[in-house]
Interface confidence: low
């Protein structure tokens, strides 16, 4: 009989439901907004904003200092009231709608969906590793605002994404902001601008550059800003909008709108659709060719890659990628495919394909028929032709206009849609050694910290644990502070190491000491942990074997047993080849003979599952006794694996030696011919792995085993004689004289 | 795995027009590359001509003038080489190949090519 | 246009010995976005071009690596480390970095 380890699911290695605590703070609200600074003289700080509320914490995340940011026209508004008398607007709630670092100053601006949008700078004044902020400016001159032109209104209530950028001794605020007619009629924030910080912190310069929802769209197409961030020479947007100005304004995409950083101009803006989708190895029948499209983004980070992604992209390793996470639809709820899926797009070829486009639009001979695009924010026009103009005039450059890249860029799922249901909410990536790990947050308030590679069909996990016990959903917006990452869900904040929180979810020794070096776990003698956790003990040098199971559960005490172990640390080595004198298997006081590996029997071990098998022959020594006794295990002197070496010994209970004892034979006669079923009873006559019935010395082809009685068909006799018959059980005879007669047929 | 094959006359007289087409299997012209003709005169000099890309533009050598063109049928996945006023200087080997993704659509070379098909100008 | 020259135009060669062909652009192949786009390709009798390298050392799968390239700006190299009889042929470089795209005019690779 041929049998199996069973195998033991990969999953079976580690349990996500260990509890771990990480630092937190209770903001006393929802979570608004969230930003870290971290200064050169080693003062750093968190600051997060709530409902009326912006608090100042340490890096150890207790509170230092917090300001009223509202409500607007409460005399309590320490913020309002560094504009001076009022009233300044209507009264109302402030909730943080814009929460910026700018460095130059470095200064602290928030802006909130009161007072007409307005912000706020609060210079940063460093107090040993602590910061304070200084008292607010307020970022307003009356006298250069107005309701059809306000330079200082920057914050929409519907969302406003903010990122600053140095030029020179400026500091410029690339602002895009979600707009409805109601917004856009009150102080005239703008879609997409360009503004510059007075050097006096009175607010922004007027005459500032500016692309808006045009009045006749503002009702059916709004434009989401999910995510904006600064890499190179530009600053980049990405939105979720309806996929068509004219269609059906809930057949959303994603598009990634692109502005120059080194110039304060929107002639160079630039927009390309992002495409991605979970494409499944094997398609199902129905399911759209090319994958399915999964349009709507819902988190996005760049970072830079490490060397394994970076490989697998083609790109070099330290080039910044955009990840996005995206959903099927505005509710991300379930259909066919996984909840989310995460896409990877290397930013150096976004910018070779908006290029590209470029060429395409302006670069003679131009396809006809291409449009400029972005017909919500300009008249619409065929290149090369700018807005709205029937043909460029000698002094107009057909570069010079905002675009639309003609096609857009398509990209599939990097986990193979083994996200499945986990519907996330938040992301950062961060580069540890040469792997590239994506830190993300859950709709029930958990952390997933995963390697980003796109080759496996299981995911590795640095971690998966949950946040707190309210289950609430982390929220987007993720902060870096030194070698720590900030999740913000419900009223609180968390601090989450990002070598991941500990080890003690990984179960096994040896998953352990695979774990990622910058984990830095080791094994505890019974459990997985970092260093200051059990000193005493704690080696990443070596792991025992683990016996988990054996077959059979009983031998005879005389005659030989193939004994089949199952486990895992046995080997080491893909191909189960053991030196010679490393493996030592006991059973009671008898030893157990190592036997060379089968090689028509290996089989390849998806990594999904993992088992190892260790097969020896067992053969009694006389002193051994009947009855139930160990089995052990014991590796030493094993040449070091990658990541360990295998050394020590394992025990597992249950394993018995049996003497058969062979009671009745019947029939005792047959014909010559053969075939006459024998019926052989008696105990322990299916112990051990090989038995055989002997007739004159042939064997009688056995038809069933059990415990007390076997069942086989007799061979051919020569001649009509009485001849004797055995029953051998692991190759020794069960004592006992018994003959068989072959008659005439 | 992705084939290109050229079909056309072998056998073109000066001054006429010169038409070619190559058929792709195993990809489809829509995807994310671009579609190029290259020949190769008597003495083995190579000569890049022009690419349709994936969204259906253009690029040709300028060493053709206007006399060159690139078409194609999405539908039969075939693209077509069209050569004005021929002479004999344009008799060659001429292949269609696919070329790069992203940039330019050429950057990294061409990675399939067709066995060619040989074309002479002579009256 | 780029002018790619090539050295030698022929090279005879003994079954197992290295081989070194050497390709200059007349201007950098270096693009804005830091890649170079130098391609290396071999014409076997009676075939098609193949591409072996590109991006100046990126092999081709199924190339085997006997095959390298190496070289920055203008100036490439092909190098074979040891010469199998499926090794002949004209070898040709391409420069995709600038349009239009233009080719060496080829070196021979040939039995001494």
């Known amino acids: 009989e041929d049998w199996q380890c069973p195998r033991t699911p990969y999953a079976a290695s580690r349990d996500f439901d260990v509890k771990y605590v990480v630092p937190s703070f209770s903001a006393g609200g929802l979570v608004q907004a969230m930003v870290t600074y971290e200064g050169d003289r080693n003062e750093s700080a968190v600051f997060v904003a709530i409902r009326n509320r912006l608090h100042v914490l340490g890096p150890d995340l207790k509170s230092v200092q917090s300001l009223a940011t509202g409500p607007a026209g409460d005399p309590g508004c320490q913020t309002c009231a560094a504009c001076g008398p009022g009233p300044h607007g209507p009264p109302g709630d402030t909730d943080t709608k814009v929460l910026v670092l700018d460095p130059a100053l470095p200064a602290l601006v928030s802006c909130g969906s009161s007072l007409q949008g307005r912000c706020f700078l609060h210079d940063l004044e460093p107090q040993g590793t602590a910061v304070h902020l200084a008292a607010p400016a307020c970022l307003f001159s009356a006298h250069h605002n107005r309701p059809d032109d306000c330079p200082d209104c920057v914050a929409s209530p519907l969302g406003t994404r903010v990122t600053v950028v140095e030029q020179g001794q400026a500091s410029y605020f690339y602002v895009a902001s979600s707009l409805d007619a109601a917004v856009a009629a009150s102080f005239s924030p703008r879609s997409v601008s360009i503004r510059r910080l007075k050097a006096d912190a009175s607010g922004f310069a007027p005459g500032f550059v500016a692309l808006s929802v045009l009045p006749k769209h503002l009702v059916s197409y709004s434009i989401e800003y999910v995510h904006s961030f600064h890499t190179g020479a530009f600053v980049y947007f990405l939105t979720v909008q309806p996929a068509s100005v004219t269609d059906d304004p809930s057949a959303l995409h994603t598009r990634l709108a692109r502005l120059s950083a080194t110039e304060p101009e929107l002639g160079d803006y630039r927009e390309l659709v992002l495409d991605c989708r979970f494409a499944p190895k094997r398609r199902r029948r129905g399911a759209p060719e090319g994958g399915q499209p999964y349009p709507v983004l819902r988190v996005a980070h760049s970072a830079p890659v490490g060397a394994q992604l970076a490989t697998e992209l083609s790109i070099a390793e330290g080039q910044e990628v955009l990840f996005g996470v995206f959903v099927t639809g505005k509710d991300g709820g379930p259909g066919v495919g996984p909840n989310s899926v995460v896409c990877a797009f290397p930013i150096d070829l976004l910018d070779t394909l908006i290029d590209e486009g470029v060429e395409r639009c302006c670069e003679s001979p131009v396809h006809p028929g291409l449009r400029r695009g972005l017909d919500f924010f300009q008249s619409p026009s065929f290149c090369p032709n700018p807005p709205g103009l029937e043909a460029l005039s000698p002094n107009t450059s057909c570069r010079h206009f905002p675009l639309l890249v003609s096609s857009s860029f398509s990209r599939v799922d990097l986990f193979n849609g083994l996200l499945g249901p986990v519907q996330v909410t938040a992301l950062y990536v961060t580069r540890l050694d040469n792997v590239t790990v994506a830190h993300m947050g859950t709709m029930d308030g958990r952390i997933l910290q995963v390697e980003l590679v796109r080759s496996l069909n299981y995911l590795l996990y640095v971690s998966n644990f949950s946040l707190g016990d309210s289950g609430q959903p982390v929220q987007r917006d993720v902060s870096r502070l030194g070698d720590h990452l900030l999740f913000a869900s419900g009223d609180q904040v968390f601090q989450v190491p990002i070598q991941g929180p500990g080890c003690r979810h990984f179960l096994t020794c040896g998953r352990c000491l695979r774990a990622w070096h910058f984990m830095g776990c080791g094994w505890c003698g019974n459990m997985c942990g970092q260093q200051k956790e059990c000193p005493g003990s704690w080696q990443q040098d070596h792991c025992p074997p683990k016996l988990t199971e054996f077959h059979p559960h009983s031998g005879p005490l005389r005659g030989s047993t193939r004994l089949t172990l199952c486990g895992s640390n046995f080997y080491l080595h893909p191909s189960g080849l053991v030196p010679e004198g490393t493996h030592q298997v006991t059973v009671g006081q008898s030893p157990c003979r190592p036997l060379p590996k089968d090689s028509s029997k290996l089989r390849p071990v998806p990594r999904k599952d993992f088992v190892e098998e260790f097969e020896c022959e067992l053969e009694p020594l006389g002193t051994q006794a009947v009855g139930p006794t160990n089995v052990s295990l014991t590796v030493t002197n094993m040449p070091p694996g990658k990541h360990f070496r295998v050394d020590g010994t394992s025990v597992l209970r249950g394993f018995s030696f049996m003497e058969p004892v062979l009671i009745a034979v019947q029939p005792l006669f047959g014909p010559r011919a053969g075939g006459t079923c024998l019926t052989l009873e008696g105990q322990s006559l299916s112990v051990g792995t090989s038995r055989a019935v002997l007739v004159n010395g042939t064997e009688c082809l056995l038809a069933r085993v059990s415990e007390g009685q076997l069942l086989c068909a007799t061979p051919p006799g020569a001649t009509v004689a009485s001849v004797p018959l055995s029953l051998q059980v692991g190759g020794a005879q069960v004592p006992g004289s018994w003959t068989f007669q072959y008659r005439e047929d | 795995d992705v084939q290109l094959q050229e079909s056309g006359p072998g056998l073109v007289k000066p001054s006429q027009s010169l038409s070619l087409t190559c058929t792709v299997t195993g990809d489809s012209i829509t995807s994310d590359y671009a579609w190029n003709w290259i020949r190769q005169f008597p003495g083995n000099k190579l000569e890049w001509m022009g690419y349709i890309s994936y969204s259906g533009s253009t690029s040709y050598n300028p060493s053709l003038k206007s006399r060159f063109s690139i078409t194609r049928d999405t539908s039969k996945n075939q693209f077509f080489l069209q050569l004005n006023s021929v002479t004999t200087e344009d008799s060659a080997t001429y292949y269609c190949?696919?070329?790069?993704?992203?940039?330019?659509?050429?950057?990294?070379?061409?990675?399939?090519w067709g066995q060619g098909t040989l074309v002479t100008v002579s009256a | 246009d780029v002018v790619m020259t090539q050295t030698p135009l022929t090279l005879s060669v003994t079954i197992g010995q290295p081989a070194s062909i050497s390709c200059k652009s007349s201007?950098?192949?270096?693009?804005?976005?830091?890649?170079?786009?130098l391609n290396w390709l071999l014409q076997r009798p009676g075939q098609s071009p193949k591409r072996l390298i590109y991006l100046v050392s990126k092999l081709d799968s199924g190339v085997p690596d006997r095959f390298s390239g190496s070289g920055s700006g203008t100036d490439f190299t092909l190098k074979i480390s040891r010469v199998e009889a499926e090794d002949l042929g004209v070898y040709y470089c391409?420069?995709?970095?600038?349009?239009?795209?233009?080719f060496g005019a080829g070196t021979k690779l040939e039995l001494k």
């Open positions: 391409l420069q995709s970095t600038h349009f239009p795209l233009t």
């Open positions: 201007q950098s192949l270096l693009y804005t976005n830091g890649k170079t786009y």
């Open positions: 190949a696919r070329g790069g993704f992203y940039y330019r659509y050429a950057g990294p070379g061409f990675a399939y």
